[in-house]
């Protein structure tokens, strides 16, 4: 598939009627990240996607109890994911279903990035990277 | 009509090769990712390995890792399971799926397989 | 490598509850899916994302989850549904696919 398909919805126009934000988080871990989805319409539930690395094929994202939420307001939808770990690392996608016309909107995705270092050896790694 | 088709099972010695097929139609192809799943007789169902929609990732279960290569090509609208040094407990039932647990490139996803074809390791 | 586990067997008689369960570590953070699969037969798929039922699906099945745990549940089990169900998810990466054992379901 090219590229440029990845961020098309079903009626090809690329992520439109969604306006995705921010398109990438850089924390460490333990913090809380926030990532918002902006619509032009309300009349449609939206749910979020995830997939690790760009490549790969998305799935529904399963919200962990006490640590990942997901709120709705007309037309602003966000998802906050509280004690960020490095399996949560990968791209976020919203995704609105509209009521009327069963279309399937997405927006162009967030990346997360959760740093911090897990090991020593890692540690080094960064170190002599930056020399 | 949207469908999947595998061919290539055959009877193979131990120690040999064989390459199963699994032609797709009535749907865009290279937007999915797809799978090969094996049931062996009197056995549950295993996942054997699974490609991104273009081809560039590919995953293996740990059974099969080193020994089978799943690729595609996407001009054929084919998923391919290259199978070599093949053993007794390879003997099962092959089928080619998509999997709704992965969604498209567009967010979408159904759920598909093939009708199986059925590879016997034996001597 | 991951597992999921489900019971080798249920038995229920036509009309009664049958209910089948699936525990694997990474449940509280990835969906199930269940199949009935019938021998000779590509499997069915009967619920997506733990509780979603395909449409075509009767309503007698049914999905839950909580915690490692997820359960398909048959209301009111008929003849017709004697076959084999797998759950099956995928590791926290997301990108191996896991079937679990397999639960043969009699309905006496």
């Known amino acids: 598939a090219r590229s440029e398909d990845r961020y098309r919805n079903p009626k090809g126009s690329a992520c439109s009627r969604i306006w995705q934000s921010p398109r990438f988080i850089a924390r460490k871990r333990g913090f809380t990240v926030k990532m918002h989805c902006y619509m032009n319409s309300a009349s449609g539930n939206v749910s979020w996607l995830w997939k690790q690395e760009m490549d790969e094929n998305p799935q529904q994202l399963k919200l962990e109890k006490g640590r990942m939420e997901e709120s709705q307001n007309e037309s602003l939808a966000t998802l906050t994911i509280q004690g960020i770990r490095f399996e949560d690392n990968g791209i976020y996608f919203c995704q609105q279903k509209c009521n009327n016309t069963s279309e399937v909107y997405q927006g162009c995705g967030t990346e997360l990035r959760v740093m911090g270092f897990s090991t020593l050896a890692q540690l080094k790694q960064r170190n002599t990277l930056k020399d | 009509e949207v469908q999947l088709v595998e061919s290539g099972g055959d009877l193979v010695q131990p120690g040999g090769s064989l390459r199963l097929s699994c032609e797709a139609s009535?749907?865009?192809?290279?937007?999915?990712?797809m799978n090969w799943v094996r049931q062996a007789p009197g056995k549950g169902l295993e996942w054997v390995s699974g490609i991104s929609g273009s081809g560039g990732t590919t995953y293996y279960a740990d059974s099969v890792k080193g020994r089978f290569t799943i690729s595609r090509d996407n001009s054929k609208n084919t998923l391919y399971l290259q199978m070599n040094s093949l053993r007794a407990e390879d003997t099962a039932v092959y089928y080619c799926?998509?999997?709704?647990?992965?969604?498209?490139?567009?967010?979408?996803?159904?759920?598909?397989w093939g009708q199986g074809t059925m590879v016997t390791v034996s001597s | 490598s991951y597992e999921l586990t489900q019971p080798p067997s249920v038995s229920v008689s036509p009309g009664q509850t049958a209910r089948i369960t699936c525990s694997g570590d990474a449940l509280p953070k990835k969906y199930a899916y269940w199949y009935q699969k019938k021998s000779g037969q590509a499997p069915v798929l009967v619920i997506h994302e733990d509780s979603k039922r395909p449409s075509g699906i009767p309503e007698r099945f049914s999905g839950s989850s909580s915690g490692t745990m997820a359960t398909l549940t048959i209301s009111g089990a008929q003849v017709e549904d004697e076959a084999d169900y797998y759950c099956f998810s995928t590791d926290r990466s997301g990108n191996h696919v896991v079937f679990g054992g397999g639960t043969k379901l009699t309905v006496l």
């Open positions: 009535g749907f865009t192809f290279s937007n999915y990712g």
């Open positions: 799926a998509n999997l709704l647990l992965w969604l498209g490139y567009h967010g979408d996803g159904f759920d598909l």
